[in-house]
């Protein structure tokens, strides 16, 4: 990469290397040969997260409850606010600017991974020996009932949506 005229955490202005403002502060005036860079702390609800020469701080993100958002982590002068979604909802993007309802897994499918504030429900088809008879965002595929352990026999085979039906053993010889 090309040579730079200044140290790290400095910038070049009018053939002069000036100190950048530290995170949480904005630039008021550039340094001169006699004076240092003048910086001021960001105001309430503002932030700057890098060494910078910005003359204005950035506004903290607003977590709009009308979009299903709530504050996960309050912003500081050096960090932005982090939003997440209300219970039962998840972010539509990494920036978490809006929320959508968690998806439910249809009958025949079970929950492989429960949704979080940032990821949707992951469903998987119930394999042979398992079933799900509900539409749910939490329920996994359940194993078919084992008739044998109850000293019963299978009267109706199970499917991916229904459990087996057990019945008494036929005593007629």
């Amino acid at each position: 990469e090309p040579p730079t005229a200044c140290r790290e955490k400095q910038y070049l202005i009018n053939s002069q290397c000036c100190s950048l403002c530290q995170p949480g502060q904005k630039l008021v005036s550039d340094c001169t040969e006699f004076t240092e860079t003048e910086c001021l702390p960001c105001g309430e609800s503002e932030f700057l997260d890098t060494w910078n020469r910005e003359t204005h701080c950035h506004q903290h993100k607003y977590c709009d409850p009308n979009l299903g958002l709530r504050v996960q982590q309050k912003g500081t002068s050096e960090t932005d606010t982090i939003c997440t979604c209300e219970e039962g909802w998840h972010c539509t993007s990494e920036a978490c600017e809006s929320c959508v309802l968690h998806r439910s897994c249809s009958p025949g499918f079970g929950v492989k991974q429960i949704a979080t504030g940032v990821s949707d429900t992951i469903c998987e088809p119930c394999p042979v020996g398992f079933f799900s008879n509900v539409s749910s965002a939490f329920e996994k595929c359940h194993p078919w009932t084992s008739c044998e352990t109850k000293d019963l026999v299978v009267q109706q085979a199970g499917t991916n949506k229904t459990d087996v039906v057990c019945g008494p053993q036929d005593r007629l010889r």
């Epitope: 790290e8 400095q10 290397c17 340094c31």
Partner: antibody, heavy 126, light 107 residues
């Protein structure tokens, strides 16, 4: 007390590479930029570039761009300077030199060298 | 790049004399100037930085002054150990450059 101890003299053929080391002691290695300065026989001082041992960031003089690499190993407080594609006019004594403390400088680069290594003579000859 | 020109390139003097070496920059570098002393076969040694600040341990017979583009190093009451080569160096922006050196010899 602060000490910068460099590796021994090297004789290299044109086109080869050389890697000089500079072991620091007596101060916090990551708190000061390390510079490399060379001096050809009977000539003046020529600045080659710096490394920030804390971040690993580097800055090389245009003349050496693409031919020099400065690295460091903070676990052993050692800085390295590697010069590739050596030519006969690279024959010189190579010095590492410690800069002012990080954060000391406010409106200049303020690179004054208060401690120097003993120098490493690199001879490039066929 | 900022060029540094020293004068004279060599000077002869006697023990007890006062000697002045000058350094001129191609642009305003105040106050970012340093002076070094280098004895034969040795590494340079920082004498003065920021134009006039004496480095710790350096005798007070060494002094620096100047502003803008013109700077001077003055050695008063020369001692035998002062006969060496002296370099100026700017520290305003990178790349750093040194003067070509001034050799101080015994008359």
């Amino acid at each position: 007390q602060v000490q910068l101890v460099q590796s021994g003299a090297e004789v290299k053929k044109p086109g080869a590479s050389v890697k000089v080391s500079c072991k620091a002691s007596g101060y916090t290695f990551t708190g000061y930029y390390m510079h490399w300065v060379r001096q050809a026989p009977g000539q003046g001082l020529e600045w080659m570039g710096w490394i920030n041992p804390d971040s690993g960031g580097t800055n090389y003089a245009q003349k050496f761009q693409g031919r020099v690499t400065m690295t460091r190993d903070t676990s052993i407080s050692t800085a390295y300077m590697e010069l590739n594609r050596l030519r006969s006019d690279d024959t010189a004594v190579y010095y590492c030199a410690r800069d002012q403390p990080l954060g000391y400088c406010t409106n200049g680069v303020c690179s004054y060298f208060d401690y120097w290594g003993q120098g490493t003579l690199v001879t490039v000859s066929s | 790049d900022i060029q540094m020109t020293q004068s004279p390139s060599s000077v002869s003097a006697s023990v007890g004399d006062r000697v002045t070496i000058t350094c001129r920059a191609t642009q305003d570098i105040r106050p970012w100037l340093a002076w070094y002393q280098q004895r034969p076969g040795k590494a340079p040694q920082l004498l003065i930085y920021r134009t006039s600040t004496l480095q710790s341990g350096v005798p007070s017979r060494f002094s620096g002054s100047g502003s803008g583009t013109d700077f001077t190093l003055t050695i008063s009451n020369l001692q035998p150990e002062d006969f060496a080569t002296y370099y100026c160096q700017h520290a305003k922006i990178f790349p750093i450059t040194f003067g070509q050196g001034t050799r101080l010899e015994i008359k």
